[in-house]
Amino acid sequence: KLTIESTPFNVAEGKEVLLLVHNLPQHLFGYSWYKGERVDGNRQIIGYVIGTQQATPGPAYSGREIIYPNASLLIQNIIQNDTGFYTLHVIKSDLVNEEATGQFRVYPELPKPSISSNNSKPVEDKDAVAFTCEPETQDATYLWWVNNQSLPVSPRLQLSNGNRTLTLFNVTRNDTASYKCETQNPVSARRSDSVILNVLYGPDAPTISPLNTSYRSGENLNLSCHAASNPPAQYSWFVNGTFQQSTQELFIPNITVNNSGSYTCQAHNSDTGLNRTTVTTITVYAEPPKPFITSNNSNPVEDEDAVALTCEPEIQNTTYLWWVNNQSLPVSPRLQLSNDNRTLTLLSVTRNDVGPYECGIQNELSVDHSDPVILNVLYGPDDPTISPSYTYYRPGVNLSLSCHAASNPPAQYSWLIDGNIQQHTQELFISNITEKNSGLYTCQANNSASGHSRTTVKTITVSAELPKPSISSNNSKPVEDKDAVAFTCEPEAQNTTYLWWVNGQSLPVSPRLQLSNGNRTLTLFNVTRNDARAYVCGIQNSVSANRSDPVTLDVLYGPDTPIISPPDSSYLSGANLNLSCHSASNPSPQYSWRINGIPQQHTQVLFIAKITPNNNGTYACFVSNLATGRNNSIVKSITVSASGTSPGLSAGA
């Protein structure tokens, strides 16, 4: 069917439109365009005859139309009067007529709108404001935006005059916003510049800050007043009804008890003509003394002494408070408070009880804190540690050992070699060592305040030959798919390379194998039964090499799903039933049987002589591994038939 499509349907003035013809018949005599919904010679725009290839303008031709060979009509430089219907009349080659009608609408390009207002400074809760979007334009839609959002739903917002006017009834301060209007028609949309609504409001009831009303003698009084207001409020202060000053802040230094009284802030808005006041009552108290802490033992010994801390001075009807490490007191059986909370006792002090400790005296206004006190807890020495941890050294190197023991006061150190005192230093240094320097090296740490001593002995071997290494393990019986195992090659030796072999081969590449600690430690993550192999570590330096004895990893696994053999499930009556159950497991699992759910025997083999049809049923084998804590089972159905009834049945064992 012949149809006309207008592209575009909505056309802007001055632009062009194409009346595009669809399904134009093939063989034509000619065609003609008419303005309107019917063929009317007086309103013919242009016609075209195929045979003569001649386009003939009609009475409605304006000079802006172009007709195309496919019968489509282009109208340029569109004017408002072009709006409406257009009819194409087609005469086919057999002189049969066909016609189709299309239409388009013409709209003007809109100018940028602006907003006019009937009230530039409305007063809150009193005035209304009417915004009007200019200019008034035919066939235009008017939209409004508040802070770039579409209009909120509110009974105080009313659109009128075809949405061209936006009225805000009883304006509030929250209406202070950016307002924009937008004009739209099908061919254009333009938005106005924003208009900021300036709502006059307030003053609200002023707020006086800070809120506290109790002060200590000698403090500075600094009160600030604020009231929401547009334009900003003018402030005045009154003390006990007497005018003081016209400022937003009131400052009185070094107040006394005489400054107690009622303080009034008055806020005034010159535009709205409104005044609001707020009163606060200030009380000034005399200053209490600053507390301090006394101790019955300034140098307590760890795990021996108790310490009593007392908050001074003693004041009647006073609440005493304590803090440790700037926190309130923790709950601990070693912390005890006296009945009046003035004395804090630490029973059997530890090195962690150093503090700081603070006490406080609470009065009507505030809490006065003491200066912090730190306890000097005497402790140690702990067992000294000798570093580095190497025990094997090559001749010719320097031996440098350092000793450290936790202690307060710091420990005094002594070194002994094979029981002979060497020197009273924290570090021992011997240059260019030989095999003769092998021996027992003892570090002794002494705390002069507590009188305690502690020693640590280390065997040092000086040898060109490396010792035979050994493998230590953090887990001798790891469980498959669960545990990790860390092998460490001992001893730790200086300038030594560590190597590993599995089943006589170098380490395979695997994301589950990880070397660390200078290759001295080999970690197997998520062990599997296949990891149950012989592991050997080796040490080597520039003059010697040695290998450990193999360590075989005993991986606990299973039990896997058991298998019942033989696989036969059909038997003849009178045969012997001999079922064997097997499950891969380390250690070997425990076996048990159930027939039709009834427990039988705890053996790997189930034997029943001369079975009958009564032995039909489900035979379940259960396996459990006590080491892995895992269980498994399998069920097999057995059918026993009377003798000679069914060929192909097993005769049994």
Epitope: Y31, V39, N42, G47, G51, H89, I91, L95, N97, E99
Partner: antibody, heavy 121, light 106 residues
Framework: EVQLLESGGGLVQPGGSLRLSCAAS????????MGWVRQAPGKGLEWVSS????????SYADSVKGRFTISRDNSKNTLYLQMNSLRAEDTAVYYC??????????????WGQGTLVTVSS | DIQMTQSPSSLSASVGDRVTITCRAS??????LNWYQQKPGKAPKLLIY???SLQSGVPSRFSGSGSGTDFTLTISSLQPEDFATYYC????????FGQGTKLEIK
């Protein structure tokens, strides 16, 4: 000046045949659509047939379809109407007419003076 | 086929009269209607095409109007040479004529 001159009319027995000719001059015949209209004695006008400028487009009234054939020879500027199986009701004055080459609903702007065909035994 | 009905079939009028002849189609034919004038013994002559377009050389006292199914031929002021038979023709398919209206001198 446009001229259309019909010929070939006459008396013919029912069931007989007749061929009418129309000699055209004064316009570009080869690009013009042509047609035949007849008028029985004392009766109104009846459109009979039309033909396109290139002979490929032809139309007929139901009353003559299958019996009459319209054709043209553009080299001779001549229009033809071959009438077979003639009946008594085919008796009429046959007019040759011209369709103007304008993009308006079809209309006949020039007519010949007509030729009389009488079908009678 | 589309039937064309003219009314009246005959009409008597005097010189100077305004005369109206109507033509009705059995279904809508848009503006596809032509009017012809025929005098006795003569070939028809085209007056109006496309319902309202006046053929070149035809006096302006002849006018046509209508669309869809109802059409009118109007002679605003009858002249002696206007007494003849008038036919309407639909330009659809096939191009059928009305039965004619005979305009006689009163």
């Amino acid at each position: 000046e446009v001229q259309l001159l019909e010929s070939g009319g006459g008396l013919v027995q029912p069931g007989g045949s007749l061929r009418l000719s129309c000699a055209a001059s004064g316009f570009t015949f080869s690009s013009s659509y042509m047609g035949w209209v007849r008028q029985a004695p004392g009766k109104g006008l009846e459109w009979v047939s039309s033909i396109g400028s290139g002979s490929y487009s032809t139309s007929y009234a139901d009353s003559v379809k299958g019996r009459f054939t319209i054709s043209r020879d553009n080299s001779k500027n001549t229009l033809y109407l071959q009438m077979n199986s003639l009946r008594a009701e085919d008796t009429a004055v046959y007019y040759c007419a011209h369709y103007p080459s304008v993009p308006f609903p079809p209309h006949l702007d020039y007519w010949g003076q007509g030729t009389l065909v009488t079908v009678s035994s | 086929d589309i039937q064309m009905t003219q009314s009246p079939s005959s009409l008597s009028a005097s010189v100077g009269d305004r005369v109206t002849i109507t033509c009705r189609a059995s279904q809508s034919i848009s503006s596809y209607l032509n009017w012809y004038q025929q005098k006795p013994g003569k070939a028809p002559k085209l007056l109006i095409y496309a319902a309202s377009s006046l053929q070149s050389g035809v006096p302006s006292r002849f006018s046509g109007s209508g669309s869809g199914t109802d059409f009118t031929l109007t002679i605003s002021s009858l002249q002696p040479e206007d007494f003849a038979t008038y036919y309407c023709q639909q330009a659809g398919n096939p191009h059928t004529f009305g039965q004619g209206t005979k305009l006689e001198i009163k």
